[in-house]
């Protein structure tokens, strides 16, 4: 079997980390290395293209590795960011890959959560039941969800605005 | 495929101001830092700033503070350099350029052609 | 703000040659450094990032190295089409800042 070079399965476009300041950030990658005898397979990240010991925020890297049964390697690093702030959010996040067979990289997508608007649905009944204030934010179609993704979303929005309803009653 | 289309060559009076755009083509600017920079003739680039078109947030070098005005127009994909009080000295071509990777990575990859911003009374 | 050098303003070399540009930083800039090529009809291309990745598309021909404040760009045998001025670029301090450029010529 011929090797390849490094593939990235994560962090990929159709994955948007979407935080609000003060939450922990944490952005898997994890990278498939097929075998190759003697190759240095190598996985690192770089914030706004440096070396996180070189950024003065605290962020944690752990890594894990795993051998399948043909000896191709899975090497999974977690950046994590305990209490991430908005410059954070703003912050460019790659992960590398190299072995013999060649270099990859990967950005992670991620975006301060915005804040979800509060809105009324007036009800048949005659009461406004307002949303958006908890539960799930409101869609965003930039985030790349599938259109399952989105009538999931809009489901469980419309049975939050049902139980308000009741709830009145 | 990536595009940035700049506007055309400026001739411009003292003490004038100009707007220089850059429409953006096959890719969605607001997952992307956009910047500017300064070349005059025979001399090296120079960073002007940048912008974030999520949020409309710029960063401008200090030698710019005072001269330059980044804006974004989302719905068409368009980033626009402000030039106020113009002087001679701000006779140079101008380049808009995107980072590599998402958001704000220090990479330049995609460049636009550049305008020519000429000031002459 | 970091002042970047690039002493040889200009250089000429033959088809097939070896060719190496330096960049001098004026404090120590970890690796943070790029390499752009402009060509005399003003398109800017990246070349190597972080000192010494090869950006997509870039021929194997070009190489970077260097640490601390000393960085250069190698074309190991120079192509018709590297005519072009080349710039360095560091990105350890803000704001960024660019080399004054190194105009390549053929002899």
């Known amino acids: 079997k011929n090797a390849v070079p490094p593939v990235i399965h994560s962090p990929n476009d159709h994955v948007v980390y979407e935080k609000e300041p003060g939450e922990e950030l944490l952005i898997p990658c994890t990278v498939y290395f097929s075998f190759l005898m003697d190759s240095r397979n190598e996985v690192w990240w770089t914030i706004d293209g440096k070396k996180p010991d070189d950024i003065t925020i605290d962020v944690t890297i752990n890594e894990s590795i795993s051998h399948s049964r043909t000896e191709d390697e899975t090497r999974t690093q977690i950046l994590s960011i305990k209490k991430v702030t908005s410059e954070d959010l703003k912050r460019s996040y790659v992960c590398h890959a190299r072995s013999a067979k060649g270099e990859v990289a990967k950005a992670a997508k991620v975006k301060q959560k915005v804040p979800a608007p509060r809105y009324t649905v007036e009800l048949a009944c005659g009461f406004g039941a307002t949303g958006g204030g908890s539960g799930k934010p409101i869609p965003n179609p930039l985030l790349g969800l599938d259109s399952t993704g989105l009538n999931d979303i809009f489901e469980a929005q419309k049975i939050e605005w049902h139980e308000h309803h009741h709830h009145h009653h | 495929e990536v595009q940035l289309q700049q506007s055309g060559a400026e001739l411009v009076k003292p003490g004038a101001s100009v707007r220089l755009s850059c429409t953006s083509s096959g890719f969605n600017i607001k997952d992307y830092f956009m910047h500017w920079v300064k070349q005059r003739t025979e001399q090296g680039l120079e960073w002007v700033g940048r912008i974030d078109p999520e949020d409309g947030e710029t960063q401008y070098a200090p030698n710019f503070q005072d001269k330059a005005t980044i804006t974004v127009d989302t719905s068409s994909n368009t980033v626009y350099l402000q030039l106020s009080s113009l002087t001679s000295e701000d006779t140079a071509v101008y380049y808009c350029?995107?980072?590599?990777?998402?958001?704000?990575?220090?990479?330049?990859?995609?460049w636009g052609q550049g305008t020519l911003v000429t000031v002459s009374p | 703000d970091i002042q970047m050098t690039q002493t040889t303003s200009s250089l000429s070399a033959s088809l097939g040659d070896r060719v190496t540009i330096s960049c001098r930083a004026s404090?120590?800039?970890?690796?943070?450094l790029n390499w752009y090529q402009q060509k005399p009809d003003g398109t800017v291309k990246l070349l190597i990032y972080?000192?010494?990745t090869l950006h997509s598309g870039v021929p194997s021909r070009f190489s970077g190295s260097g640490s601390g404040t000393d960085y250069s760009l190698t074309i190991s045998n120079l192509e018709p089409e590297d005519i072009a001025t080349y710039y360095c670029?560091?990105?350890?301090?803000?704001?960024?800042?660019f080399g004054s450029g190194t105009k390549l010529e053929i002899k």
């Open positions: 404090q120590d800039i970890s690796n943070y």
């Open positions: 972080y000192t010494s």
């Open positions: 670029h560091q990105y350890s301090k803000f704001p960024p800042t």
């Open positions: 350029f995107r980072p590599l990777y998402y958001g704000n990575s220090p990479w330049f990859a995609y």
